[in-house]
């Protein structure tokens, strides 16, 4: 091997990747908020809805201070992969009532996939463990009724909104540690 020639800089570095992840998360949060509002207008929710297959919220305001980079990124990636699966399921099995929201759900899925790719690149560049912790994947069957799919959509969008909200806070806090 010859003398070191040096390499041109690639398009980004881990800190830029983290900045990009924050921007993508904020953008996705705004999209989710808007879509959830549309859902409430079209199909008013009677109280809070939940779905057993959704991940439990990872963080609360009180635990933000003790966040560690590997834990946050791994958990965020696992949770977002679950929400991606649920959005794909909604688009596939949501039924005629949700067809009117198809363009918005498609855009949401594309943004989710983009954020997941950015997080993966960040974890690769930092050389953090990427394997998702083993957890049972609950199979998503077809909704029991049209109202069932609407309730599921409310639950998915509500959960994603909360997850993205803590993600923005967590990622901004982690920026100071990288």
């Amino acid at each position: 091997p010859g003398p070191p020639a040096g390499s041109p800089r690639v398009s980004s570095d881990p800190r830029a990747d983290l900045d990009s992840a924050v921007l993508l998360t904020r953008s996705l949060l705004a999209d989710t908020r808007q879509l959830a509002a549309q859902m409430r207008d079209k199909f008013p929710a009677d109280g809070d809805h939940s779905l057993d297959s959704l991940p439990t919220l990872a963080m609360s305001a009180g635990t933000l201070g003790s966040l560690q980079l590997p834990g946050v990124l791994t958990r965020l990636r696992v949770d977002l992969m679950s929400y991606l699966r649920h959005v794909q399921w909604l688009r596939r099995a949501g039924g005629p009532s949700l067809k009117t929201l198809e363009p918005e759900l498609g855009a949401l899925q594309a943004r989710l996939e983009r954020l997941l790719r950015r997080l993966q690149l960040l974890m690769s560049r930092l050389a953090l463990p990427q394997a998702a912790p083993d957890q049972p994947v609950i199979p998503l069957g077809p909704p029991a009724s049209a109202w069932g799919s609407i309730r599921a959509a409310h639950a998915i969008l509500g959960g994603l909104h909360l997850t993205l909200d803590w993600a923005v806070r967590g990622l901004l806090l982690l920026k100071t540690r990288l």
């Epitope: 690639v10 570095d13 881990p14 690769s124 990427q130």
Partner: antibody, heavy 114, light 111 residues
Framework: EVQLLESGGGLVQPGGSLRLSCAAS????SSWGMHWVRQAPGKGLE????????????YYADSVKGRFTISRDNSKNTLYLQMNSLRAEDTAVYYC???????WGQGTLVTVSS | QSVLTQPPSASGTPGQRVTISCTGS?????????VHWYQQLPGTAPKLLIY???ERPSGVPDRFSGSKSGTSASLAISGLRSEDEADYYC???????????FGGGTKLTVL
């Protein structure tokens, strides 16, 4: 411009030890995970080991586990590979690489032979 | 034997388009991990050509493009040039290794 400069290679007898170093410059070393990747003469690339940006995670290929140790000193912008119990099949050019890997050094040749 | 499978050789004439495939498994490409491609010119160190399936680092011509589907990926080189003659490697993170795995490499010959 990013530079990764490996050193410490050479000829060593089977069972012997070597310590490779990689001096990094031109980027924020402490923000990047670092790898060692090797290439035997006329063969393809084989990943050897990785260490996370802060040194808290270290992983090894099965072929070197228990014999090689990766470490880093972020204050010196330097990556290390301690190689013990060397075998003939460890003969290769050893590259230091950063990121996915995004950046590669020019490599240092390690020859294990009696 | 490499964890990612590539054809050992590929060839094309100047101006042609060539494609190099890379097949993985459920612990790497199939697990959703991104694929990266490297070019190694004779006697030199590998150079990152494509990262995250289809993104080009600055300075890499747009003649090079990547794609990924399921457990496989491919690198396409259009408008082939003599200076593209090199070894090309794919790589992806692997869950079972906790590190990247490389393909066996494809030697590209420009006829």
């Amino acid at each position: 411009e990013v530079q990764l400069l490996e050193s410490g290679g050479g000829l060593v007898q089977p069972g012997g030890s070597l310590r490779l170093s990689c001096a990094a410059s031109g980027f924020t070393f402490s923000s990047w995970g670092m790898h060692w990747v090797r290439q035997a003469p006329g063969k393809g690339l084989e990943w050897v080991s990785v260490i996370s940006y802060d040194g808290s995670y270290k992983y090894y290929a099965d072929s070197v586990k228990g014999r090689f140790t990766i470490s880093r000193d972020n204050s010196k912008n330097t990556l290390y590979l301690q190689m013990n119990s060397l075998r003939a099949e460890d003969t290769a050019v050893y590259y230091c690489a950063a990121g996915v890997p995004d950046y590669w050094g020019q490599g240092t040749l390690v020859t294990v032979s009696s | 034997q490499s964890v990612l499978t590539q054809p050992p050789s590929a060839s094309g004439t100047p101006g042609q388009r060539v494609t190099i495939s890379c097949t993985g498994s459920s612990s790497n490409i199939g697990a959703g991990y991104d694929v990266h491609w490297y070019q190694q010119l004779p006697g030199t160190a590998p150079k990152l050509l494509i990262y995250s399936n289809n993104e080009r680092p600055s300075g890499v011509p747009d003649r090079f493009s990547g794609s990924k589907s399921g457990t496989s990926a491919s690198l396409a080189i259009s408008g082939l040039r003599s200076e593209d003659e090199a070894d090309y490697y794919c790589a992806a993170w692997d869950d079972s290794l906790n590190g990247p795995v490389f393909g066996g490499g494809t030697k590209l010959t420009v006829l």
